[in-house]
Amino acid sequence: SIPWNLERITPPRYRADEYQPPDGGSLVEVYLLDTSIQSDHREIEGRVMVTDFENVPEEDGTRFHRQASKCDSHGTHLAGVVSGRDAGVAKGASMRSLRVLNCQGKGTVSGTLIGLEFIRKSQLVQPVGPLVVLLPLAGGYSRVLNAACQRLARAGVVLVTAAGNFRDDACLYSPASAPEVITVGATNAQDQPVTLGTLGTNFGRCVDLFAPGEDIIGASSDCSTCFVSQSGTSQAAAHVAGIAAMMLSAEPELTLAELRQRLIHFSAKDVINEAWFPEDQRVLTPNLVAALPPSTHGAGWQLFCRTVWSAHSGPTRMATAVARCAPDEELLSCSSFSRSGKRRGERMEAQGGKLVCRAHNAFGGEGVYAIARCCLLPQANCSVHTAPPAEASMGTRVHCHQQGHVLTGCSSHWEVEDLGTHKPPVLRPRGQPNQCVGHREASIHASCCHAPGLECKVKEHGIPAPQEQVTVACEEGWTLTGCSALPGTSHVLGAYAVDNTCVVRSRDVSTTGSTSEGAVTAVAICCRSRHLAQASQELQGSTSGSGLNDIFEAQKIEWHEHHHHHH
Amino acid sequence: QEDEDGDYEELVLALRSEEDGLAEAPEHGTTATFHRCAKDPWRLPGTYVVVLKEETHLSQSERTARRLQAQAARRGYLTKILHVFHGLLPGFLVKMSGDLLELALKLPHVDYIEEDSSVFAQ
């Protein structure tokens, strides 16, 4: 049978043992910044070009013996995972290696920066097709390394990095914490987060998704036909770099934002056992395991959205947290969450010509998170309509009054410390979908968007008795753009989107008691784009034989177990 | 890349202008910041990435690096420019004593300075 990791990233339709991942990625160049590599290994021979770039520190210790196979071990294995003939993800991808890690696997931020600059200069001198840069390394948080990654990403390069093997918050490490980079955590054959000795995969809001990263068979530098099993978030990142190469080869015009959204969309959802993560990190960590898309077409019509969590605001009374979308994504809604329940809501506001989501802490609160729903909506024109707190007891309302604008999200923000002491508002009257309602003490913000063919509807799920979690999901073909709670009372901890489900969390039932205030409604706004669907159908009608499906069909190669497996 | 400054006179001129109180001051109201790795064993003191403001040209980067060398020399410190960045971020990599950080942060065009640190295979 094929190795478990290749089977895991293969879409269900192709899970039969005799199938292998497609021989794709041929239009893409993958840069690997790692150790030196054994370029004549049978797995990668002719696929990896070793550049003359080398920027490494001296090895530690006076008695260190430089042994070629040890020096090449990490990089060779990763090159094999990305594009290896037998055990690679993107068998058609060509690679270029830069040596930024020494024989002990150690490098410097400055060396990595100069390596990234080398890639940018190479790209300018000789522009090729899509570029993927794999950074299977991590150091402490570095402003300059993150900035360099941001610049390279804005130059159209896709950067994929390891989340880190420190069993810690990935936001404390670089380049894992750079928002423009696709940060990958590691899972095993049981879809458990990978444990590595006393440590393991990093987690948290800076991780974009997980991928296979334990017991990964790949090229060994011990000999030119040897194979070895290695584990780590580097291996996981190599899988995602391979998947990205496949996607970009099939659709070379994909932007970084589109690629990231597709990676998230085609991932296996909710398969990771979150109990492994620290309790406070579970809600922030994406429960996603990377997979190849079943085909390239059929994705174009989809309205893609993802959830972006802010950093924690901190506990001071006036503390705020800000969540931002990528430059070519639209902020379609904004929500907030506080573990203590003490928060003053959230609002969408303009910052540097772009909408951001800002959440507000309350007195006595331990801090808040802002949660942005970031979507790909071409030719969108979005604005925020605000209604100040209402005088009447009916609550505050705001709707999208511009012609052709639809409601994509509702936010509410209040100055009073505790809304719970006030009478909750009545629920929205039926038949008014383009309207946000909220507590009379709160100002309400409606996100209103106009985009070709965009249609949205509101879906609610109310529970009369208090419950820790209320959810409502959008049905097939619709995408969750907005997630909020009714009413905005103090026992509601907040609302956030998990994939296509709106989750509203409330305080522990035992602490709130079963009062009328216990009633909580989760409100989801579900949207779709008929325009994107039409465009996609036209595209499918005019093309043939260029999708991943076709490559899959053509590549029914058996996995041969005739190699030496050195463990 | 090849060094494009060449004019060593500038070093001496920079020294004289400072002594005459003519040295260019950093832009008003902007304070450059210093950053270092939170994980102490990973720090690499003695090597610093001086990041300049976004629109700084290569020639200005080289001039700023030379100015740092001149001002450091006046204080009896050696500085070694290991690389001048351009293409992604403007700035330079410098080997110098941490005693010079205060001086370096006051140079024109400087956005922030980061102490070098280690990265590791994962």
Epitope: V56, E58, G111 | Q1, L11, Y77, L82, K95
Partner: antibody, heavy 121, light 107 residues
Framework: QVQLVQSGAEVKKPGASVKVSCKAS????????IHWVRQAPGQGLEWMGE????????KFNQKFKDRVTMTRDTSISTAYMELSRLRSDDTAVYYC??????????????WGQGTTVTVSS | DIVMTQSPSSLSASVGDRVTITCKAS??????VAWYQQKPGKSPKLLIY???NRYTGVPSRFSGSGSGTDFTLTISSLQPEDFATYFC?????????FGGGTKVEIK
């Protein structure tokens, strides 16, 4: 042990170019700047320039700026110095030297054996 | 360029003699001065760095002093293997420059 081994002696005609190599061993080549220094017969030492092998950043003596090129090949841990438009007064022994940096001190701690370049018509 | 003027250009001494070589910089070079020894047909060898620090493996009879513009290399008791040419070098600013050399010969 740490050493720098240079290429053999060269005889060149005026106007020609010469390329001298300097192969490093016993240390991480990209971790140290390589300098080039020349010594005309019976004369003192003259610094020509330097290259940081890890970033290809170079610095030259103005005197040679238009005629000298310094490169390196990290795959074989070798630095190169090419001098063009040779004149008879370029006849000299050309040395490569490794620069060692210790906090606020630096110096040339390892030198190549030298390459004699003779320029004669 | 900073000019390093070395004196004397040559000297004759006997084994056991105390020998002093001086180097004067045309401008302040602080302590950024190194001293090298070169034997005929050989590469220079580092003796002293940062004006007064003896390099690893260099015998204690070699010492350096000075700062600013005036520097001295002293050999406290000349040994047979010390007959060679000595160069000072400044690395305070580019271009790095060397003194003209002092040839120490047997009297």
């Amino acid at each position: 042990q740490v050493q720098l081994v240079q290429s053999g002696a060269e005889v060149k005609k005026p106007g020609a170019s010469v390329k001298v190599s300097c192969k490093a061993s016993g240390y991480t080549f990209t971790g140290y700047t390589i300098h080039w220094v020349r010594q005309a017969p019976g004369q003192g030492l003259e610094w020509m320039g330097e290259i940081n092998p890890s970033s290809t950043y170079t610095k030259f003596n103005q005197k040679f700026k238009d005629r000298v090129t310094m490169t390196r090949d990290t795959s074989i841990s070798t630095a190169y110095m090419e001098l063009s438009r040779l004149r008879s007064d370029d006849t000299a022994v050309y040395y490569c030297a490794r620069e060692r940096i210790y906090s606020n001190y630096w110096f040339f701690d390892v030198w190549g054996q030298g390459t004699t370049v003779t320029v004669s018509s | 360029d900073i000019v390093m003027t070395q004196s004397p250009s040559s000297l004759s001494a006997s084994v056991g003699d105390r020998v002093t070589i001086t180097c004067k910089a045309s401008q302040n070079v602080y302590t950024a001065v190194a001293w090298y020894q070169q034997k005929p047909g050989k590469s220079p060898k580092l003796l002293i760095y940062s004006a007064s620090n003896r390099y690893t493996g260099v015998p204690s009879r070699f010492s350096g002093s000075g700062s600013g513009t005036d520097f001295t290399l002293t050999i406290s008791s000349l040994q047979p293997e010390d007959f060679a040419t000595y160069f000072c070098q400044q690395y305070s600013s580019y271009p790095y420059t060397f003194g003209g050399g002092t040839k120490v010969e047997i009297k």
